[in-house]
C-alpha cells in the first residue's frame, strides 16, 4: 500500500513539476525591468527565453521574438537547451511512469518490469528537475552579473539593437516558477526511485531447507510477499497560474485593455 502511494504521489508531484517547467519555459517574465531606484517610466519591459515584451502605460503590449539564432548570447541558448532537455526527459518519464504505475494493469506485466520502469522514470524526473533548476539558475546568474554592469541590458547588440537607455533587469516570475517546478520534479523522481525498491520482488540468497523432525516432516519455503492493494485515490490536479509581471504601481490584475497602473 505504502509503495503504491509513494509511486502514485511521485507521479503526481512530477506531473505538476513538469507542467511548471513547461509553463516557465513559455513565460515571458524571465527578467523584468527593475523599478527600484529607477525613474518611473511609462513603459515596462520584460523578457523571456523566446521574446521580449514592452507594456505601455496605455496598456498596449508589444512582444518581439528573438528571430536571430546566432546573435543570441550563448548563455541564453544554453538555458533554452537545458529547459527543453528537461521538458523532453520529463515527458518521456511521465509516459514511462504511467505504464509503471502499480494501480494500472497492462497485460501480464511482471512486477520486476514495473520496478525497472519506475526506476527509469524516477531517474528521468531527477535529471529533468536538475536541468530546469540548472537552466533557471544560469539565467539568474546572468541577470545578477548584468545587473551590476554599466551596459544594463543583457541583450545588448542582439539583432542589431543598440542600448541607449539604461534599463536594469531583475528576476521575473518565471524564475521562481522554474525553481519550484524543478524542485517538485526532482522530489517526484526521488519518490519514484524509493517506490521502485518496494516494487521489486525480494530475491532470497538461500534455498529452501528441509527440517526432519521425529514423527513427521515439514518443508518451509520462504516466499516473496506481494502487495495486492490498488492505488485508488482520484487526484485531480488543477494548476492555476498567473504569470503577469507587476509594476510598482499595480495592485491587481484586470481584464481590460491595459493592466498597468
Amino acid at each position: 500500500m505504502a509503495v503504491t502511494a509513494c509511486q502514485g504521489l511521485g507521479f503526481v508531484v512530477s506531473l505538476i513539476g513538469i507542467a511548471g517547467i513547461i509553463a516557465a519555459t513559455c513565460m515571458d517574465q524571465w527578467s523584468t525591468q527593475d523599478l527600484y531606484n529607477n525613474p518611473v517610466t511609462a513603459v515596462f519591459n520584460y523578457q523571456g527565453l523566446w521574446r521580449s515584451c514592452v507594456r505601455e502605460s496605455s496598456g498596449f503590449t508589444e512582444c518581439r521574438g528573438y528571430f536571430t539564432l546566432l546573435g543570441l548570447p550563448a548563455m541564453l541558448q544554453a538555458v533554452r537547451a537545458l529547459m527543453i532537455v528537461g521538458i523532453v526527459l520529463g515527458a518521456i518519464g511521465l509516459l514511462v511512469s504511467i505504464f509503471a504505475l502499480k494501480c494500472i494493469r497492462i497485460g501480464s506485466m511482471e512486477d520486476s518490469a514495473k520496478a525497472n520502469m519506475t526506476l527509469t522514470s524516477g531517474i528521468m524526473f531527477i535529471v529533468s528537475g536538475l536541468c530546469a533548476i540548472a537552466g533557471v539558475s544560469v539565467f539568474a546568474n546572468m541577470l545578477v552579473t548584468n545587473f551590476w554592469m554599466s551596459t544594463a541590458n543583457m541583450y545588448t547588440g542582439m539583432g542589431g539593437m543598440v542600448q541607449t537607455v539604461q534599463t536594469r533587469y531583475t528576476f521575473g516570475a518565471a524564475l521562481f516558477v522554474g525553481w519550484v517546478a524543478g524542485g517538485l520534479t526532482l522530489i517526484g523522481g526521488v519518490m519514484m526511485c524509493i517506490a521502485c525498491r518496494g516494487l521489486a520482488p525480494e530475491e532470497t540468497n538461500y534455498k529452501a531447507v528441509s527440517y526432519h523432525a521425529s514423527g513427521h516432516s515439514v518443508a518451509y519455503k520462504p516466499g516473496g510477499f506481494k502487495a495486492s492493494t490498488g492505488f485508488g485515490s482520484n487526484t485531480k490536479n488543477k494548476k492555476i497560474y498567473d504569470g503577469g509581471a507587476r509594476t510598482e504601481d499595480e495592485v491587481q490584475s484586470y481584464p481590460s485593455k491595459h493592466d498597468y497602473v
Epitope: Q33, P39, V40, T41, A42, V43, N45, Y46, Q47, S52, C53, V54, E56, S57, S58, G59, F60, E62, R64, N153, M161, Q163, T164, V165, T167, D249, E250, V251, Q252, Y254, S256, K257, H258, V261
Partner: antibody
Framework: EVQLQQSGPELVKPGASVKMSCKAS????????MHWVKQKPGQGLEWIGY????????KYSERFKGKATLTSDKSSSTAYMELSSLTSDDSAVYYC???????????WGQGTSVTVSS | DIVMTQSPSSLTVTAGEKVTMRCKST????????????LTWYQQKPGQSPKLLIY???TRESGVPERFTGSGSGTDFTLTISSVQAEDLAVYYC?????????FGPGTKLERK
C-alpha cells in the same frame, strides 16, 4: 465615435474647491487611462496625473499632489477631478484626455475653464 | 523631471513653405525593449483642444495629413511640415511619453508671414 465631454466653466472664490467632470462615450471607459492636463491662459501644457477607471488607481505629478484628486464612476463612464484650496495660480483650462498607443493622448475633452477670483 | 525644449519658439511662414521645428529632451526617450522613441507631437489651434499628430516619434496618427513627418531618436527630434497650409497655423507641442511625470515642451508657434 469617441467623445470626451467636459463640464462647463467655473468661477470660484480663493480657498474654495471645484469638481469638474469628463464624460466618456464611444469606447470602453474602463479600458483606457484618463489623463488630466492644465493650461494657463497663453501658456503651455502641464500634466496633472491620471486615473485608471478599472480599479481607480491613480498617479499624480508631484506638483499636483494634495491639490488635485482624481476619481471615476464606472456606471456613468465619467472621470472627475477635484481641485482644492484654490488660488489665482489655479486659474486655467483643464483638459481630460484618453491615453492610447505610444502613451499618446489621442482624444481630448473640450476643456473646463476655471477662474479663481474674489 | 525630464525637461523638454523646443526651437524656435515661433516661426513666420508662407503657404507652401517647408517648415522644420525641433524638440530636445534632457534624457533619452528611446526604450531598449522595443526600440521605440516615446515622443509625441500635438497641434493646438487657437481656442481649441490639443490634437494628436505623431506618436512613437514618427508614427502618424490616423487622419493626419502626410505632409506632417516626425523624425529623430534618443534626445533630438524634429517635426517637419513639407508644405504648410493655412490650416496648419497653430502651436505645436512635443511631449515626453516615456518618463513620469509626462512633460510637454513650451511649444513652437506657427504664424502667417
Amino acid at each position: 465615435e469617441v467623445q470626451l465631454q467636459q463640464s462647463g466653466p467655473e468661477l470660484v472664490k480663493p480657498g474654495a474647491s471645484v469638481k469638474m467632470s469628463c464624460k466618456a462615450s464611444g469606447y470602453t471607459f474602463t479600458g483606457f487611462l484618463m489623463h488630466w492636463v492644465k493650461q494657463k491662459p497663453g501658456q503651455g501644457l502641464e500634466w496633472i496625473g491620471y486615473i485608471n477607471p478599472y480599479n481607480d488607481g491613480t498617479k499624480y505629478s508631484e506638483r499636483f499632489k494634495g491639490k488635485a484628486t482624481l476619481t471615476s464612476d464606472k456606471s456613468s463612464s465619467t472621470a472627475y477631478m477635484e481641485l482644492s484650496s484654490l488660488t489665482s495660480d489655479d486659474s486655467a483650462v483643464y483638459y481630460c484626455a484618453r491615453l492610447d498607443y505610444g502613451n499618446a493622448m489621442d482624444y481630448w475633452g473640450q476643456g473646463t475653464s476655471v477662474t479663481v477670483s474674489s | 523631471d525630464i525637461v523638454m525644449t523646443q526651437s524656435p519658439s515661433s516661426l513666420t511662414v508662407t503657404a507652401g513653405e517647408k517648415v522644420t521645428m525641433r524638440c530636445k529632451s534632457t534624457q533619452s526617450l528611446l526604450n531598449s525593449g522595443n526600440q521605440r522613441n516615446y515622443l509625441t507631437w500635438y497641434q493646438q489651434k487657437p481656442g481649441q483642444s490639443p490634437k494628436l499628430l505623431i506618436y512613437w516619434a514618427s508614427t502618424r496618427e490616423s487622419g493626419v495629413p502626410e505632409r506632417f513627418t516626425g523624425s529623430g531618436s534618443g534626445t533630438d527630434f524634429t517635426l517637419t511640415i513639407s508644405s504648410v497650409q493655412a490650416e496648419d497655423l497653430a502651436v505645436y507641442y512635443c511631449q515626453n511619453a516615456y518618463y513620469y511625470p509626462l512633460t510637454f515642451g513650451p511649444g513652437t508657434k506657427l504664424e502667417r508671414k
